[in-house]
Every structure is written in structure tokens, then in C-alpha cells.
């Protein structure tokens, strides 16, 4: 008789794929012209990335450091009207993209939480949560919570409002902290909170260190759902050496949890790489005309248009990974096991019941290495086969779909491999 299938876990929409942050509407759409109506026209692009949620804003009225002139219920007219926002929500819903609204109050100011008036700001946030939930948003983000006095209790209250409205709504909190103790204490009082932090960016970017960071995090947070990013708001290029960008995309998409990206991560957009741009919000490079100030500053391979036409580009890799992440059971909610491999490598398996299994091997080193996979520390339920099929490599030159002998597996410098193999009873 065939073995019984394992019962599927309850899956919320944010478990099914990546979140995409657009913190600056104008920079995302190009020079100074960005508004909600224009963003509607970019939803097809977001669909092509197969992201599940859009983390948007802040969009509310905020006069720098002035509580009285900060209104979390009013959209800043520079971004459009409430009607434009409603239209965006409707259009996003039709494309199965959820919209999460950033309500960080003093986003134009010095202290994002108006340090002296925390209580009155917290009440405003409470009111805003209810208002925007009724307007149809799918969740909220608040950032810099390390600067919010008594953050845990406020977050618990806000999560109650959010989940009280519907279990299908999400609260994301962001912190600049990379301290695991601090992160765990924030998570403890909120069962369903998604927390973005700088935890992974406090790294020596070696295979061993990354492995220990990931396993420590997963052990400390128990069986709760995680999110993976390198910061609460910034671009990957601001934290990573360029040669590790592809490797990290592969890792973020295949770790157990929700990957969270910022606009531009999919093309390797760099903060302040072009003259005169704001550091934190570089202009999105849609095509070569996106940066008209200096002719020739943008080459095709830096842009969405150029990379869309190149199957070997970072954008193509992102799309492939996002596609796999959103449809494969083992990547959606599979168990996770790391195992020993050569120095400089980080290797792990994702598996779910009798579904196809995935092996990830990441070479963080500057030299080519033998994988040296040692499956002895894997549980019997996750044993390795002798061969696995290549789903993708982060480097060009390997033939997708080809079977690779695991015992003789070698990786190029900074190469990551995603391999698949079937369940065998």
C-alpha cells in the first residue's frame, strides 16, 4: 500500500512567495513623476516577478518632525488621492498581488517615531490600522521599531487589531538591529509578526558563517515562520559584495520563510551609483532613458529592459527562482536540513513528504571547490541520492536539467546550485 500523504500545513498568502518593497514611489517609477496611478501601470511587471505582496510607502502626509502635521489617514497629494489608492488595490487584487502599507509615521523626519510623543503617535497608528484595513489593504509595515519605546506591547496591540480584522492580514516590523537576542524578544510577544532586520548583513560572508547565522536564527525562533532579507529597507547591493548577489538571491528564495526584496534587487540596482541620486532611493532603471541627466551613464545590461532580453541576467535568475519558490511544495513549506560540505560552502536540503526534493549548494569562496557533500548528518527522511538534476546555476555554462553526480560535484567561485531529485520510498 502507498504511504499516507503528510497533511499540508495551513498556508497564508505571504508563505507562498516573495514580498517586494517600494519605499519610494517616485524613485521606483523614474524621475520625479511617480504616483499611485503610474504604479498601476507597473503591476504587470510585478506579476512577471511572481511576487506575492507589494510593501508600499509610506504614502501618508508627513511634515518633517511635526506630529500635528502628520496624518496617517491622508495620502500625500504628491502621490495621488485616496481614489487612486483604491483603484490600485482593485487592480492589484485582480493580479493576485497583495498590498501592504507602510505606516512608519515620521518617514520624512529625524526620528521615525517622534521620540517625545510616542503615546499619541501610537494612538494615531491604531486608528490608521483600522481605517486602512477597512479600505482593503492586506497588511502593514512599521520600521525602525528599535526607536519605539515599549515596542513589544505596541506591536502586540497592533497585531491584535490586524489579526482581529482577519487572520489573512499581515503585520511586518522592521528593525536596524542585527542582535539575535533583541530580535527574539521582539518576536516572542507576537505570534504572527514578520520581522525584517539587519541580522544576515552582520556577516563575514563566508559559507561557514552564513550557515551558522541561518541555523542559529532558525533554532532561536523555533517553528515560527521567518522572513529573510539583509535589512529592513535597503538594497542588497548596499550590503553585499557584488559577486555574491546571485548566490544570495538563490539562498533567500530557498530558505524556509518569506524572502523580502526591495525594488531594484532583481536587477542589482546600486544605491547612489549614478551621480546626484539619493543614497537610499536610487531611480529604478527601466531602460537606458531612465537616467537622462548624464547620457550614456546607463548601459542596457543595467536595466529591466536589457536584462529581460538576456536569459543569463540577474533578473532572469530572479524570475526563475521566484517561479520555483511559488510552485514547489518542498520550497513552499518543506523541512530544512543543513549538512556538512567542503570549507567555504553552505549546503542544505528542502523536502516535503513524497514531493520532489531540492538540494542547494552555495560556494561563498573566491576559488572553485569540490562540494564534498557528507550526508551522514542528515536524517533518514532526507537522504541524498547519487545523482540530482540541475534546476539552475547562478553562473553561466551549465546545462539546465542535466544530471550531476553528487560525489564528484565541483563548484565555480561564488557559484550556487539548485538541484532536484525525486522522493524514493
Amino acid at each position: 500500500r502507498a504511504p499516507r500523504c503528510r497533511e499540508l500545513p495551513a498556508q497564508k498568502w505571504w508563505h507562498t512567495g516573495a514580498l517586494y518593497r517600494i519605499g519610494d514611489l517616485q524613485a521606483f517609477q523614474g524621475h520625479g513623476s511617480g504616483n499611485l496611478a503610474g504604479l498601476k501601470g507597473r503591476l504587470d511587471y510585478l506579476s512577471s516577478l511572481k511576487v506575492k505582496g507589494l510593501v508600499l510607502g509610506p504614502l501618508h502626509k508627513n511634515q518633517k518632525d511635526d506630529v500635528a502635521q502628520t496624518d496617517l489617514l491622508q495620502i500625500d497629494p504628491n502621490f495621488g488621492s485616496k481614489e487612486d489608492f483604491d483603484n490600485l488595490l482593485q487592480s492589484a487584487k485582480k493580479k493576485s498581488i497583495r498590498v501592504i502599507l507602510d505606516l512608519t509615521p515620521n518617514y520624512r523626519g529625524e526620528n521615525l517615531w517622534f521620540s517625545t510623543q510616542v503615546d499619541s503617535v501610537a494612538t494615531k497608528v491604531k486608528d490608521a490600522l483600522e481605517f486602512w484595513l477597512q479600505a482593503g489593504v492586506d497588511g502593514f509595515q512599521v520600521r525602525d521599531i528599535e526607536n519605539l519605546k515599549d515596542a513589544s506591547s505596541f506591536l502586540a496591540e497592533w497585531e491584535n487589531i490586524t489579526k482581529g480584522f482577519s487572520e489573512d492580514r499581515l503585520l511586518i516590523a522592521g528593525t536596524n538591529s542585527s542582535d539575535l537576542q533583541q530580535i527574539v524578544s521582539l518576536l516572542e510577544s507576537n505570534k504572527d509578526l514578520l520581522l525584517t532586520s539587519s541580522y544576515l548583513s552582520d556577516s563575514s560572508f563566508t559559507g561557514e558563517h552564513t550557515k551558522s547565522l541561518v541555523t542559529q536564527y532558525l533554532n532561536a525562533t523555533g517553528n515560527r515562520w521567518c522572513s529573510w532579507s539583509l535589512s529592513q529597507a535597503g538594497l542588497l547591493t548596499s550590503f553585499l559584495p557584488a559577486q555574491l548577489l546571485r548566490l544570495y538571491q538563490l539562498m533567500l528564495f530557498t530558505l524556509p520563510g518569506t524572502p523580502v526584496f526591495s525594488y531594484g534587487d532583481e536587477i542589482g540596482l546600486k544605491a547612489a551609483a549614478l551621480p546626484g541620486q539619493p543614497v537610499e532611493a536610487p531611480v529604478m532603471l527601466w531602460d537606458e532613458s531612465s537616467f537622462p541627466d548624464i547620457p550614456g551613464a546607463v548601459s542596457a545590461n543595467m536595466t529591466v529592459k536589457g536584462q529581460s532580453e538576456d536569459p543569463g541576467s540577474l533578473l532572469s535568475l530572479f524570475r526563475q527562482l521566484s517561479d520555483q519558490r511559488s510552485k514547489e511544495r518542498s520550497l513552499l513549506h518543506g523541512d530544512f536540513h543543513t549538512f556538512s560540505s567542503g570549507p567555504g560552502l553552505f549546503s542544505y536540503i528542502r523536502h516535503w513528504d513524497q514531493n520532489e526534493r531540492f538540494l542547494v549548494v552555495l560556494n561563498f569562496g573566491d576559488v572553485g571547490l569540490s562540494a564534498g557533500l557528507q550526508a551522514s548528518d542528515l536524517p533518514a527522511s532526507a537522504s541524498l541520492p547519487t545523482k540530482a538534476d540541475l534546476v539552475l546555476s547562478t553562473q553561466p555554462g551549465r546545462e539546465e536539467g542535466s544530471p550531476l553526480e553528487l560525489e564528484r560535484l565541483k563548484l565555480e567561485p561564488h557559484e550556487g546550485l539548485l538541484l532536484r531529485f525525486p522522493y524514493v520510498a
Epitope: 496617517l72 489617514l73 494612538t123 494615531k124 486608528d127 490608521a128 483600522e130 481605517f131 477597512q134 479600505a135
Partner: nanobody, 125 residues
């Protein structure tokens, strides 16, 4: 059961002001979001504005922004609508409403559980 009674309506010239009150009885309204709506003859009921439980937050429809102000006195169980620079197109029956489930009443009238009977406001040119 919450009973809402509006008052303060009347006839006023364009450019003039009125202050409407909405007195609640039966239950304290300090944990309810409160909203004001209006209905002109032959038209749909239209959202005017809303105020949160504590009075910290207010939200208005674009056509009244900067002219109308909603406030509340929870000790008196009363909500107010201050209307300045009135225009003939503000002519309508004005209703107050209570949302018992949310601290922040919303812009759709379906979200409100209790309604007053309304007070007529007529603005002549």
C-alpha cells in the same frame, strides 16, 4: 442599543457657518468610531467625515476638507460637525452614525450599526 439624535441644522446663507451636534444615549460611545453622512434630495447617502474613538484621528471627504471639522466630547457622549464657508451644494439632510466594531469609522455607510434620524441643512445663495 444606542440612540443617536442630531440637532443644529437650519437655513443659512452661502459662506455662513453651522454647528451640528449628535447626542448619544443608551450606551457610552467612547469605544465607537463615529461618522457623519449626508443625503441631498434624489441622491445617494454620501460620506462626509469620521472621527476615531479618542478623537485623535479624523478623515474627511475631499469636498469638505478644510471647511468642516469633526470633534467629540466623550464625557458628554456627543459628536460635533462644525461647518464653515458653506456652499449651496452642501444642502442635504445630515446624519451621524456609530461603528461599534471599529475605533475608526470608515467611509462606507455599510460599516455603521446605528444611525440618527438626520437634521436638515439648507444653504441659500
Amino acid at each position: 442599543q444606542v440612540h443617536l439624535v442630531e440637532s443644529g441644522g437650519g437655513l443659512v446663507q452661502a459662506g455662513g457657518s453651522l454647528r451640528l451636534s449628535c447626542a448619544a444615549s443608551g450606551r457610552t460611545i467612547s469605544t465607537y468610531g463615529m461618522g457623519w453622512f449626508r443625503q441631498a434630495p434624489g441622491k445617494e447617502r454620501e460620506f462626509v467625515g469620521t472621527i476615531s474613538c479618542s478623537g485623535t484621528s479624523t478623515y474627511y471627504t475631499d469636498s469638505v476638507k478644510g471647511r468642516f471639522t469633526i470633534s467629540r466630547d466623550n464625557a458628554k457622549n456627543t459628536v460635533y460637525l462644525e461647518m464653515n464657508s458653506l456652499k449651496p451644494e452642501d444642502t442635504a439632510v445630515y446624519f451621524c452614525a456609530a461603528d461599534t466594531r471599529h475605533c475608526m469609522g470608515y467611509t462606507k455607510h455599510g460599516g455603521y450599526d446605528y444611525w440618527g434620524q438626520g437634521t436638515q441643512v439648507t444653504v441659500s445663495s
